[in-house]
């Protein structure tokens, strides 16, 4: 590959690429060194090549770009800005590329970008404007339809002094740019809670994956606005019970399928409403697999087989009768 490039100067919003132009005229259909290209499939794969930067000479025809298994570390503003722009780029996979910093405007100048996968990168520093590209209160709508953010939590010693959940949610909500998002995957991120405003501002969601987190409760989460939601993955969390409000909201979603396997359900008196609901609802997939984790006497009991007599709470003794 000769050192030509189709990158150019978007100096205001993409200073990083303002200097990515060579002396020769660009060869827009050239395949970068260390990459494999198929013009017929409109696909470029630069996989497991230890790249430290996004290639500058990506062919203009690229629709599917795989940059997985590299060592990119940081995505600056305009990391994919080119002249002419990568107008066809629809699917971008950056998973497992050791990214820990994604800056504001990193995905600007990609007008057709519908699928973005940042999974398996330790994102200690995800800018609130990574996806919106602007700090305006209302940004131009992002074309993103699928955003895959599985296992982006950094190791504990690399996390900043702020809520990781909050950082991710700020990026999802900035400028209301992701109003058209249909699939959001946030699995395996050690989320302890789901900020209450996040779902209300993603009204187009069809698929939401929150599996393998540490969610204890959905009490303050509202699903009411997600009228298009088709699948909700809550497997492998720390859920103890779903309360009436949540049950009613889920039941009211016309197309929903909910996945609840492998949660430590607490089968006491607070579980009665959920058990009743499970017996009647069709929305829970594999509901016959749900079992109690606590109390000990109820461990491994199938929720669907419980009746109200099984679900008791130990009486709370008045302080005068409590013993140490």
């Amino acid at each position: 590959s000769s050192p030509t490039s189709s990158a150019s100067s978007f100096s205001s919003s993409a200073p990083f690429l303002a200097s990515a132009v060579s002396a020769q005229p660009p060869l827009p259909d050239q395949c970068p060194a260390l990459c494999e290209c198929s013009e017929a499939a409109r696909t470029v794969k630069c996989v497991n090549r230890n790249l430290t930067e996004v290639p500058t000479d990506l062919p203009a025809y690229v629709r599917n770009l795989f940059l997985t298994g590299n060592q990119l570390a940081v995505l600056p503003a305009g990391a994919f800005a080119r002249r002419p722009p990568l107008a066809e780029l629809a699917a971008l996979n950056l998973s497992g590329s050791r990214l820990d910093e994604v800056r504001a405007g990193a995905f600007e100048h990609l007008p057709s970008l519908r699928q973005l996968d940042l999974s398996h990168n330790p994102l200690a520093d995800l800018s609130p404007f990574a996806f919106s590209g602007s700090n305006a209160s209302v940004s131009a709508p992002s074309p993103l339809v699928e955003l895959i953010l599985n296992h982006i939590v950094p190791p504990e010693d690399e996390r900043q002094n702020r809520s990781f959940e909050g950082m991710v949610v700020a990026a999802l909500l900035a400028g209301r740019a992701l109003q058209g998002l249909r699939r959001l995957e946030l699995a395996s991120n050690h989320f302890l809670y789901l900020p209450r405003d996040v779902l209300a501002q993603l009204p187009s969601l069809r698929h939401l994956d929150l599996s393998n987190n540490s969610l204890v409760s959905l009490t303050y989460v509202s699903f009411r606005n997600l009228t298009h939601l088709e699948s909700l993955h809550l497997e492998d969390n720390a859920l103890k019970v779903l309360h009436n409000g949540t049950l009613a909201e889920l039941q009211g979603l016309p197309h929903i399928r909910v996945f609840l396997d492998n949660n430590p359900w607490v089968c006491d008196c607070h579980m009665a409403d959920m058990v009743t609901w499970l017996k009647e609802t069709e929305v829970v997939q594999g509901k016959d697999r749900l079992t109690c984790a606590y109390p000990e006497k109820m461990r491994n009991r199938v929720l669907l087989e419980l009746n109200s007599a099984d679900l008791d709470c130990d009486p709370i003794l008045p302080p005068s009768l409590q013993t140490s």
Epitope: P32, A33, E53, D57
Partner: antibody, heavy 120, light 111 residues
Framework: EVQLVESGGGVVQPGRSLRLSCAAS????????MHWVRQAPGKGLEWVAY????????YYADTVKGRFTISRDNSKNTLYLQMNSLRAEDTAVYYC?????????????WGQGTTVTVSS | DIVMTQSPDSLAVSLGERATINCRAS??????????LHWYQQKPGQPPKLLIY???NLESGVPDRFSGSGSGTDFTLTISSLQAEDVAVYYC?????????FGQGTKLEIK
């Protein structure tokens, strides 16, 4: 021991061309990005160009964009800078330098430099 | 482009005394993950040499009398006890974005 040795400098007239080379030894050349940095007489340091380890990324200072081309031959452990349409203001000592990446990197090894003089 | 401004332009310090050189960037060159600021020493007739990377990390083989600090836009290079061999020009450099730019240099001399 890491060694970078530049060559190809000289006196050239404005508008003419010159090609600089940088021979690398003592490290795995193909694992490192490379830069050219220059220093005009009595002046400070100015970054000129960068090429990634596998020649997938190229970046240039505005002052040389469209005139200079950076390239490398990993089989020969050699970095190049093709300089066309030279101007008087390109007069400088040109250093090649090594880095582990563009933004997260730094210039951790330098050559002794080669002098380019553009004069009529 | 990010402008790097060093102060002072020149500095004379007695042997064994502390020398401090400042560098200011026209915008922040730090993220929560990394600080994109590095220091170099250039002795007369020689190429530059890396001293400090990412604001505060001492390059291998550099004497520990050299130290760096700072974040955001303001950075400092300190030589705790000046030695005769430290006479040189010192440059800061950012790697936040392209173009990479250097400070104008600070000339350090013996008083």
């Amino acid at each position: 021991e890491v060694q970078l040795v530049e060559s190809g400098g000289g006196v050239v007239q404005p508008g003419r061309s010159l090609r600089l080379s940088c021979a690398a030894s003592g490290f795995t050349f193909s694992n490192f990005g490379m830069h050219w940095v220059r220093q005009a007489p009595g002046k400070g340091l100015e970054w000129v160009a960068y090429i990634s380890s596998g020649s997938t990324s190229f970046y240039y200072a505005d002052t040389v964009k469209g005139r200079f081309t950076i390239s490398r031959d990993n089989s020969k452990n050699t970095l190049y800078l093709q300089m066309n349409s030279l101007r008087a203001e390109d007069t400088a000592v040109y250093y090649c330098s090594r880095t582990n990446s563009l933004l997260r990197g730094f210039f951790d090894a330098w050559g002794q430099g080669t002098t380019v003089t553009v004069s009529s | 482009d990010i402008v790097m401004t060093q102060s002072p332009d020149s500095l004379a310090v007695s042997l064994g005394e502390r020398a401090t050189i400042n560098c200011r960037a026209s915008q922040s060159v730090s993220s929560s993950s990394y600080t994109y600021l590095h220091w170099y020493q250039q002795k007369p007739g020689q190429p530059p040499k890396l001293l400090i990377y990412s604001a505060s990390n001492l390059e291998s083989g550099v004497p520990d009398r050299f130290s760096g600090s700072g974040s955001g836009t303001d950075f400092t290079l300190t030589i705790s006890s000046l030695q005769a061999e430290d006479v040189a020009v010192y440059y800061c450099q950012h790697s936040w974005e392209i173009p990479l730019t250097f400070g104008q240099g600070t000339k350090l001399e013996i008083k």
